[in-house]
Interface confidence: medium
């Protein structure tokens, strides 16, 4: 028996985190988003959950929608009418997958304060929006399209396709919601609320996931649901635009897929209305290195949609996939004609383009040595941005606006210099014309939401601080957080570590590295967080480290794509050559060294357990994906190509976590699924067990029955921290 | 059960080049991390070379870096070692060895002559 | 680097007799990254001992290592008569990694 080694922070009153602390969320932070409803107007849910009203300029305020009115329905959110007139309550919310849930909604009458009787909504209803203009109501249910003019009126049913697991209708089925949308819906009203654009998804030919949901009931039931895996046949997609004026009068109208799409098996990818009778639509060729943005226009006399070729502009990769996780959208400017779009440039950073008629014509805006991540708005004079140029950091997010009025363009960052230490990665949220906008700091400090003036950026009112849980976290020994990179050969990683109190370089220290590593993700951010890790660092003394290996994002499309077609490569040797490095500064304990992942991070934790290097002495993989065979076709493809043999199948085959089966034998391992997981399917994790046991590998599991990938249920959640904290600890021989 | 077998020693001149290769089998070859290790006649034995399984990350002896070359093919199983600029120190049995920390497995060897 | 040196030269004992390897670091090692091996003439080397104390596949229990920081032993409880050869420690945590220049353990 080794003698356990017990970390105490010394001599402070301040106390250590505890897991109860993170369990319960203590010390969760707020941030404060403006529901926007004109240029100076937005409406916020008050901690009593009034809805209230704001306006900026007037600084009047007031409560819209009472909490009462909200408790009388049990509504959890809500949504006003353009014309003011109407709220609709949502209430009765159950999860669906990622962003899809079902509710029921009611409709509240603000002027007579009362709900709208007659022609009530029917329930679940799939998704519920107003028009852009008026009151007008679109919403999906069963799968099928239906319009109401007013809320009172009776409804007008748009399709009547739609039926469960075979077509969609103005929803994503499960690929295009997780791995093309990341919405829940799949419609779009023009800007003056004249026409609705949807997608109707043909699931009829995919193959069906089909697991257990055990419940309480005597037979579990199955849940089915179609899943196109690597190679399988994926959904048959086609866009419509309906006249909601005249819905009865004409049918929906199919927008036309470019030629050079439509040749072979494709995607659509995003829909943009760039003025009331004018549409972009994005499509991408199943092998994802090219897409094509495709502008429309309305034809009157036609009653029809026409893309004009000499509208169609093609992106392309030729080192990897097109964009980054996501193919870019446009932000189009006040002509409806040219944009500003985020792609690749020459030397492979990610920076935004101006194009006025071909994207080989393109001016370029921005340019340097890092990218350009989000457009958030253009207006007649400025375009607002966010990069990871300031001081070459790439984990941080800064907010630009280059002035488009001026000649040439002028550039400011509207954020560096505003709370220089505590915050370093922003978000914003602009009004219609970007009049006001907020800035939303996530750190590294404490998060703090402020109000701004569009046009002299000074800011108006703090919106949220975190006062409490400031007070809350005066007495908290929280760890020192450090970003930097190490160098190896010609590569630099960035990394976080994340040091226990009273951290002395002269002692060693357990390390455990939290790994994600997936293609075009950044886990080494400048962000404000007290989570498991953080725990682990306060209480254990552990020395926690993540490390942004290659294919990781911001860092130009070389580092990006360097893992294309091979996954499960460069990511894992990239964590392997960081952990030497650390064992090289001397502080960490080589006997002592762990790594663990969820999803990805699992992937990526289990191959590097089983690298055969003897570096880690234990390791956790969470709902890891094992093999690329098993997870969905548009992931899969989009980094690895088909699994086929005039492909890729060889690197599918190579790089699944069963083929190192024997490579456990002198690591620990903990193996932990949902058997509920409906995007990383238990499968995978079925087949890391079968293949350890058949190499008679010994390793530790645990299961979560009828737990989805994020194995959120509260009682399941504190089991999960709860079992890897003894774990982990036991490896690491620290007392309990 | 796991074989190594090395192939393509011989004798050359200085200044001349061999490719040796080591043929895997028994074991899964591409995520395990191999290595060249050499022992000149009569005496201890020098690592001289390892590559990741992937290939992706390589590491030499300094007295080989810029001479010698480590390679591997995964859908061959097998390992290579490329010697350009042969001097006569170079005169060794080379074996190709699986694993990084400790070798687990060694191939018999093959012998490399580097004489005028 | 991290130079290895082993002691003695040559041992030279008789079968049936304890013999106690010594290999001094010129820097402190991790357990984890010491190896030990076994070469008999004109045969490949063998693992023996790696992790510092661990037992590699199929080697019989006569054979332990020990040892921590810069000082690691390789002792074999009774010499059988296939336990003459040279014995290398190796280490593999400075970069590059380096072997011992060798033990003879020779019949007496």
């Known amino acids: 028996l080794r003698p356990s080694r017990v970390y105490k922070p010394e001599g402070n009153t301040k106390r250590a985190l505890t897991l109860k602390d993170i369990l319960n969320g203590t010390f969760s932070y707020k941030t404060y988003f403006p529901n926007w409803i004109s240029e100076q107007e937005y409406l916020h849910q008050s901690e009593d959950d009034n809805i209230v009203f704001y306006n900026i300029e007037t600084r009047e305020s007031y409560i819209i929608l009472s909490n009462s009115t909200m408790k009388s329905v049990n509504a959890t959110d809500y949504g006003l009418s353009p014309d003011r007139q109407f709220v609709y309550l949502e209430s009765d919310y159950s999860k669906l997958w990622r962003y899809s849930y079902t509710a029921t909604y009611y409709i509240y009458d603000l002027q007579n304060g009362e709900f709208v009787r007659g022609y009530e909504l029917p329930r679940p209803i799939q998704y519920l929006c107003w028009s852009p203009v008026g009151s007008k109501l679109a919403y999906v249910y069963q799968n099928n399209i239906y319009l109401k003019q007013r809320p009172g009126d009776p409804p007008f049913q748009i399709t009547y396709t739609g039926r469960e697991n075979r077509i969609f209708n103005g929803i994503p089925d499960w690929v295009y919601e997780e791995e093309m949308l990341a919405t829940k819906y799949a419609l779009w009203w023009s800007p003056d609320g004249k026409f609705l654009a949807y997608v109707e998804f043909n699931d009829s030919d995919i193959p069906i996931i089909a697991y257990s949901y055990y419940g309480d009931g005597q037979y579990p039931r199955t849940i089915n649901i179609p899943y196109p895996k690597a190679g399988a046949k994926n959904p048959v997609v086609r866009v419509f635009i309906v006249d909601t004026t005249y819905p009865h009068h004409v049918g929906p109208m199919e927008v036309p897929v470019p030629e050079m799409i439509a040749s072979s098996d494709y995607y659509f990818s995003w829909l943009t209305w760039v003025s009331s009778e004018r549409v972009c639509l994005q499509w991408l060729k199943r092998v994802q290195n090219v897409s094509v943005l495709s502008i429309c226009d309305f034809r009157e006399d036609w009653h029809a949609w026409e893309c004009p070729k000499n509208q169609e502009h093609v992106e392309e990769s030729r080192t990897g996939w097109a964009g980054g996780f996501f193919v870019s959208t446009p932000a189009f400017s006040q002509d409806a004609t040219s944009y500003y779009k985020i792609f690749s440039d020459k030397d492979g950073y990610k920076h935004i383009h101006y194009i006025k008629d071909t994207v080989e014509n393109a001016i370029q805006i921005t340019s340097g040595k890092w990218e350009a991540i989000y457009i958030f708005r253009v207006t007649q004079d400025s375009l607002f941005y966010s990069s990871n140029e300031f001081e070459g950091y790439p984990g941080r997010r800064n907010i630009y606006r280059i002035s488009i009025g001026n000649s040439p363009p002028s550039k400011k960052c509207v954020t560096c210099h505003l709370r220089k230490e505590r915050c370093q990665y922003y978000t914003a949220s602009f009004s219609y014309k970007a009049k006001y906008y907020a800035l939303v700091c996530y750190g590294p400090g404490l998060p703090i939401s402020t109000l701004h003036d569009g046009r002299t950026d000074q800011e108006i009112q703090v919106l949220e601080e975190n006062k409490e849980l400031e007070n809350s976290l005066r007495n908290i020994q929280l760890p020192k957080v450090e970003i930097k990179k190490l160098k190896d050969g010609g590569l630099t990683f960035w990394y976080k570590m994340i040091l226990p109190p009273q951290f002395d370089r002269s002692k060693k220290y357990p390390l455990l590295i939290q790994v994600y590593g997936g293609p075009c993700s950044q886990s080494v951010k400048s962000v404000f967080a007290v989570n498991w890790i953080t725990y682990l660092a306060s209480k254990e003394g552990i020395v926690i480290a993540l490390v942004d290996g290659r294919g990781t994002a911001f860092q130009g499309d070389k580092f990006l794509h360097a893992v294309y077609r091979k996954l499960g490569v460069y990511e894992v040797e990239d964590q392997l050559t960081a952990v030497r490095k650390f064992i090289e500064m001397g502080f960490i304990d080589e006997e002592r060294i762990a790594i663990w992942g969820w999803s990805y991070g699992g992937y990526v934790s289990s191959l590097a357990l089983a690298s055969g290097t003897g570096l880690f002495k234990c390791g956790i993989a969470v709902a890891p994906v094992s093999s690329w065979e098993y997870y969905a076709s548009i992931y899969s493809e989009r980094f690895m190509g088909l699994p086929t043999k005039d492909d890729n199948l060889e690197h599918y085959k190579n790089s699944t976590v069963m083929a190192r089966a024997e490579y456990f034998r002198n690591v620990d391992y903990l193996l932990i699924h949902g058997t509920a997981d409906d995007n990383v399917h238990f499968q995978n994790s079925a087949q890391i067990a079968k293949a350890l046991v058949n190499a008679q590998v010994d390793f530790q599991a645990m299961w979560y029955s009828d737990q989805n990938h994020g194995i959120s249920s509260g009682r399941s959640q504190n089991h999960l921290y709860t079992h890897m904290t003894h774990f982990l600890k036991q490896c690491f021989s620290l007392s309990d | 059960e796991v074989q190594l077998l090395e192939s393509g020693g011989g004798l050359v001149q200085p200044g001349g080049s061999l490719r040796l290769s080591c043929a895997a089998s028994g074991f899964t070859f591409s995520p395990a991390y191999m290595s060249w290790v050499r022992q000149a006649p009569g005496k201890g034995l020098e690592w001289v070379s390892a590559i990741s399984g992937s290939g992706g990350s390589t590491y030499y002896a300094d007295s080989v870096k810029g001479r010698f070359t480590i390679s591997r093919d995964n859908s061959k199983n097998t390992l290579y070692l490329q010697m350009n600029s042969l001097r006569a120190e170079d005169t060794a049995v080379y074996y190709c060895a699986k694993g990084w920390r400790a070798f687990d497995y060694w191939g018999q060897g093959t012998l490399v002559t580097v004489s005028s | 680097e991290i130079v290895l040196t082993q002691s003695p030269g040559t041992l030279s004992l008789s079968p049936g007799e304890r013999a106690t390897l010594s290999c001094r670091a010129s820097q402190s090692v991790s357990r984890n990254y010491l190896a030990w091996y076994q070469q008999k003439p004109g045969q490949a080397p063998r693992l023996l001992i790696y992790g510092a104390s661990s037992r590699a596949t199929g080697i019989p229990d006569r054979f332990s290592g020990s040892g921590s920081g810069t000082d690691f032993t390789l002792t074999i409880s009774r010499l059988e008569p296939e336990d003459f050869a040279v014995y290398y420690c190796?280490?593999?945590?400075?970069?590059?990694?380096?072997f011992g220049q060798g033990t003879k353990v020779e019949i007496k």
């Open positions: 190796q280490q593999s945590l400075g970069y590059p990694p380096t």
